[in-house]
Interface confidence: medium
């Protein structure tokens, strides 16, 4: 912590500008008014203060707002956000999506830090649910965001938000997460026609039950092997050879290459050899 010293004559900062980068830490502490800093926070991001100097500026804001910063200051924190601890952020009440975007922009290109995770948690809890605009924003910055949530947290995602989800946002989701998301997706896309519906629901199918897979097999969807391999084993096992053949269409030949991997391996073992032979792929049950 910087000790309190009087500001040298003529050094009192009338505004936040680039001349301050040449101030020593004790001069920043003594000569920059905290209230002035708070009202001109938008300028700080355009000034290349060193991290040591940013520590001083943060200290001044902490003294001015011991209960947590107001959103008017938070929105303009810029690089100073990188100096905040999760404990600091837990004191904030962030309600504006613009504020969230501004702070995520600062951390752009880096993996999610504890600060960012805390910020997002505060924001989502404040909103009560993960609405479409928020999800849109979060997945744009962190494609893996959705899959970082627990099934319990995902249960608060309204079906309308599912429209914001892109296939790559689900790449790292496990079956438990897809079990929660699939019914929401099914509800969200229910009014779409067959082929359009399949395009949208495809990346969520790792959470689909057997009856839905059976229904899809009647719609000439031509599911690719990559999607098939992500289906729940327990959902695939009851499917007949004819149903799998209809589900995969021309991609059925790919089963041979995957015959040693789940769920294909387990499914093959459940089928009658006569039925498997009808595929002409040499699959051995």
């Amino acid at each position: 912590e910087v000790e309190k010293t009087a500001c040298p004559s003529g050094k009192k900062a009338p505004e936040i500008d680039e001349s301050l980068i040449f101030y020593k830490k004790w001069e920043l502490e003594a000569c920059v008014d905290a209230a002035l800093l708070a009202t001109q926070m938008d300028r700080v991001n355009a000034i290349p203060f060193t991290y040591e100097q940013l520590d001083v500026l943060k200290h001044k804001l902490d003294e001015l707002y011991p209960q947590g910063y107001p959103e008017s200051v938070i929105q303009h924190l810029g690089y100073l956000f990188l100096k905040m601890s999760p404990e600091d952020i837990r004191k904030w009440n962030v309600t504006s999506l613009e504020t969230l975007k501004a702070l995520l922009e600062v951390n752009k290109g880096h993996e999610m830090s504890p600060q960012v995770a805390t910020l997002i948690d505060r924001f989502v809890k404040g909103r009560g649910q993960l609405d479409k605009d928020t999800l849109d924003t979060l997945t744009a910055f962190y494609p893996g965001y959705l899959c970082s949530l627990s099934p319990e947290e995902l249960s608060s995602v309204p079906p309308s938000s599912i429209w914001a989800v892109r296939p790559q946002d689900l790449d790292t989701c496990d079956p438990r997460q897809l079990d929660v998301l699939y019914p929401k997706a099914r509800l969200a896309f229910q009014n779409m026609n067959g082929s359009e519906y399949f395009v949208k629901i495809q990346s969520f199918l790792g959470g689909a039950p057997t009856e839905d897979l059976k229904a899809l097999s009647q719609q000439n969807v031509s599911m690719d092997l990559a999607t098939f391999m992500k289906l729940r084993t327990d959902a695939v096992l009851p499917l007949t050879v004819a149903e799998v053949q209809k589900l995969l269409g021309p991609h059925v030949e790919g089963l041979k290459a995957e015959e040693r991997h789940r769920p294909v391996r387990d499914w093959i073992l459940r089928q009658r050899q006569d039925d498997l032979d009808t595929l002409g792929l040499g699959l051995q049950g």
């Epitope: 040449f22 355009a46 000034i47 290349p48 060193t50 040591e52 100097q53 990188l82 951390n107």
Partner: antibody
Amino acid sequence: QVQLQQPGTELVKPGASVKLSCKASGYTFTSYWMHWVKQRPGQGLEWIGHSNPSNGGTNYNEKFKSKATLTVDKSSSTAYMQLSSLTSEDSAVYYCARWVRGSNYEYFDVWGTGTTVTVSS
Amino acid sequence: DIVMTQSQKFMSTTVGDRVSIICKASQNVGSAVAWCQQKPGQSPKLLIYSASNRYTGVPDRFTGSGSGTDFTLTISNMQSEDLADYFCQQYSSYPLTFAGGTKLEIK
């Protein structure tokens, strides 16, 4: 990948000026401050100053305030440094360097290829 | 201005050696120090930042340590490709300043 391309050499006469360029590629030019550094043989490196490509803001080492002028051209992602009233003391290699900061660090992560300025009549 | 000093301008070494290069700051700079390597005719390359963090792609034989005013760059198993100039730089306060550097040479 991130690159900062500088012309290799500049031969100038004493008293003249020279404008050095630093063309950035492989990243968003306006997202990072650009610094300039002087290196004379056997004398280490000296920080000249930096410019903020997003708004053209500049800061100079007091020692170089009357020597260097930093500018940027966003449209071509190029930073410039003009050196004036050149003397033999200004003969050196001049580097541009990108300044990066993240959640707990800051540093020059990429240096330009360097321009050798020779002041000679 | 903060003065950075590397008192050894040259160091003789052999392949396999453990080499320590020392850098001193004229005042406390915390951990705001970086180490760079520069080979003849080339631009400097970042090795260590924040005094002790190895930059991406830098071999783990390079380590940085220290804080406050005393900093050390250590090469644990000297290789022939490590023959170069090494310099430290502070970014605790402006103007940013560099030490004169240490040139590693073969004995």
